[in-house]
């Protein structure tokens, strides 16, 4: 029986050109996480696997950073990044848990800023 629940950041907004942290939290289960997939609509952004580490989709390789923890940081945001994002937790023995986040990328400066990441 799947007892766990996924808590997400819900609906979030960020400024064009800025960055944002996408985070999900799995709770109320003792199941072990084996892998977390991050997807944008039907497109894979990243996979975090216990043994293989992080795989970042080639189309996002220069503007996606792992973390914090199992979260994902999106950088250099464009209006095209607006949309639904999903965290998919693969666990044993429970199975799969999915969380949803809606990101809106705004032109104005009223949106919240993301993390302090640097790309050399």
């Amino acid at each position: 029986m799947m007892t766990g629940t996924i808590e997400t950041t819900g609906n979030i907004s960020a400024e064009k050109g800025g960055s944002i942290i996408l985070q999900c939290h799995l709770s109320s289960t003792t199941a072990q996480v084996t892998q977390v997939n991050w997807e944008q609509q039907d497109q894979l952004l990243a996979i975090c696997n216990a043994d293989l580490g992080w795989h970042i989709s080639p189309s996002f390789k220069d503007r996606v950073a792992p973390g914090p923890g199992l979260g994902l940081t999106l950088q250099s945001l464009t209006v095209n990044d607006t949309g639904e994002y999903f965290c998919i937790y693969h666990t044993y023995p429970d199975g799969t848990y999915t969380g949803r986040i809606f990101l809106e990328v705004l032109e104005s400066s009223v949106a919240e800023h993301g993390a302090r990441f640097q790309i050399p």
Partner: antibody, heavy 117, light 107 residues
Framework: QVQLQQSGPELVKPGSSVKMSCKAS????????MHWVKQQPGQGLEWIGC????????NYNEKFKVKATLTSDKSSSTAYMELSSLASEDSAVYYC??????????WGQGTLVTVSA | DIVLTQSPATLSVTPGDSVSLSCRAS??????LHWYQQKSHESPRLLIK???QSISGIPSRFSGSGSGTDFTLSINSVETEDFGMYFC?????????FGSGTKLEIK
Amino acid sequence: QVQLQQSGPELVKPGSSVKMSCKASGFPFANHVMHWVKQQPGQGLEWIGCIFPFNEITNYNEKFKVKATLTSDKSSSTAYMELSSLASEDSAVYYCAREQLGSFAYWGQGTLVTVSA
Amino acid sequence: DIVLTQSPATLSVTPGDSVSLSCRASQNIRSNLHWYQQKSHESPRLLIKYASQSISGIPSRFSGSGSGTDFTLSINSVETEDFGMYFCQHINNWPFTFGSGTKLEIK
């Protein structure tokens, strides 16, 4: 098996710089976030920052942003940390650690840095 | 930054005793908390991840509980090899921080 082999102890003069290494083996280095942690003698642990070798993206604890520079070399599976403008308070053991699903599952043996005139 | 407060600073116990170590976060970190053990002149070792999840190779006498702001590491029937320092760490957001540690010593 997973191993993190850190470089040997360093005795350095105040004001100078030091660059230490953390050579990884037994796992795909480029795909794992590598962290650095400071521990002064008899004290607790302080997170310095991390690097994702795949795209060289770094994240620093604000406290160490000027002090530390993190780099990596995928070809040799090695993470590096350079500390600049060294002072007595930089004397410490510095650990590298590999993240696994958000936890620091593997640690190097530590590099002791002693700053003394 | 999130502050993790560990208590007590030192815990003196006799082998065979069962003990509880506390870690309190300055804000809600959900279950994003790990526990590490560090023996003298050794590197830290991961004991418990995400507040309560066990780690392969770690004896079953170690267990963790809590979420939000209050967390506990329990050791059921302490053995001599368990003496040393214990640190909690959060990974809820940047920067990650550690607690100041609890020293488990022989009475």
